[in-house]
């Protein structure tokens, strides 16, 4: 009997509303002996892949995203998922990545100003689909 | 009001272990990420790590196999083993989630006091 | 692994006059860094984050800014209560996260 895969966790370092042209990473933890991450955008047709996991404790695995100047079309909903052989797990929870002016002055990044984007509540997807494996050979449309 | 305070200080054996315990009043863990920071007598802060809102926990690299951070609903423990002089501290517990970054920190527990000797 | 230098690690400055520390970062960290103020005996209190903003209830005598990888604080109209240690403190991630090793501040 194949083993039944724990849903995989999502964050966000620093945080989750990141001013604009500064950096973030999204972090994806599961357990261990987990082959890809992906990290998708807003919709399954939006992803990035990973084979570079590290161990983060002896019972996770971790895979880290990075954005290295955030856009204001890096807004939007994020989740993870994993690839475990021989299935894929399913969805973390979505995480909802916020972008806000910076502060301004001679030393912030210099990027377009975007609009200021208050606190949300973020929502939550505890559906179980059931996710597809990727077609090997065959790449969505990246992330960023 | 919102407060923090640590617990469980004490006078440990070179090669122990000890528990601390943060308890929270004034809010709810499931909306604040906490962090244990330590800072040696006349030395400098030292941050140790954080539990995430949902239980993921990271830590500083030298942390990574002797401290464990875990949760309940109101409480947040840093457990400590092999514990050595070095260890030597006040720990302090904190509230991340300022301006909503993780790991800045604007509600401090006092600190409790930590000392490994024989 | 990520290294915050904090300079000078200790100053002395009069009442009302002006102290300035510094911060540098041996890798880019955008404008992630806090500056906190300790007293004695006490935890530390945030004051400055996103390198210039000021924490709730801070006043303006407080002030930060951003040069690349340097950052500076600065204290100006030093009051007796202004006495305390400063630290800088990146937050930019869990594989960077780390402190300044501290400026005391003695006012004469």
């Known amino acids: 009997q194949e083993e039944d895969l724990p849903r995989p966790s999502i964050s966000a370092e620093p945080g989750t509303v990141i001013p604009l042209g500064s950096h973030v990473t999204f972090v994806c933890r599961g357990p261990v002996g987990v082959q890809t991450f992906r990290l998708e955008r807003d919709s399954r047709s939006t992803y990035n892949d990973t084979e570079d996991v590290s161990q983060a404790s002896p019972s996770e695995s971790e895979a880290r995203f990075r954005i290295d100047s955030v856009r204001e079309g890096n807004a939007g909903l994020y989740r993870c998922i994993y690839y475990k052989p021989p299935k894929w797990s399913e969805q973390s929870d979505y995480l909802e990545l916020l972008v806000k002016e910076s502060s301004g002055g001679p030393d912030s990044p210099d990027t377009e100003p975007g609009s200021s984007a208050g606190p949300t509540q973020r929502p939550s997807d505890n559906s179980h689909n059931e996710h597809a494996p990727a077609s090997q050979g065959l790449k969505a449309e990246h992330l960023y | 009001e919102q407060s923090v305070e640590e617990s469980g200080g004490g006078l440990v054996a070179p090669g122990g272990s000890l528990t601390l315990t943060c308890t929270v009043s004034?809010?709810?863990?499931?909306?604040?990420?906490m962090g244990w920071v330590r800072q040696a007598p006349g030395k400098g802060l030292e941050w140790i790590g954080y539990?995430?809102?949902?239980?993921t926990t990271f830590y500083a690299s030298w942390a990574k196999g002797r401290f464990t951070i875990s949760k309940t609903s109101t409480t947040v423990d840093l457990k400590m083993t092999r514990l050595t002089t070095g260890d030597t501290a006040t720990y302090f517990c904190?509230?991340?989630?300022?301006?909503?970054?993780?790991?800045?920190?604007?509600?401090w527990g006092p600190g409790t006091l930590v000392t490994i000797s024989s | 692994e990520l290294v915050l230098t904090q300079t000078p690690a200790s100053v002395e400055a009069a009442v009302g006059g002006t102290v300035t520390i510094n911060c540098q970062a041996s890798?880019?960290?955008?404008?992630?860094l806090a500056w906190y103020q300790q007293k004695p005996g006490q935890p530390p209190k945030l004051l400055i984050y996103?390198?210039?903003d000021l924490a709730s209830g801070v006043p303006s005598r407080f002030k930060g800014s951003r040069s690349g990888t340097e950052f500076t604080f600065t204290i100006s109209d030093l009051e007796c209560a202004d006495a305390a240690t400063y630290y800088c403190?990146?937050?930019?991630?869990?594989?960077?996260?780390?402190f300044g090793g501290g400026t005391e501040v003695e006012i004469k």
């Open positions: 904190a509230r991340g989630g300022y301006a909503d970054y993780n790991i800045l920190y604007n509600l």
């Open positions: 004034g809010f709810s863990l499931s909306n604040y990420h």
């Open positions: 539990i995430y809102t949902h239980g």
């Open positions: 890798q880019s960290i955008s404008s992630y």
């Open positions: 996103d390198a210039s």
């Open positions: 403190q990146t937050y930019d991630s869990s594989t960077t996260a780390a």
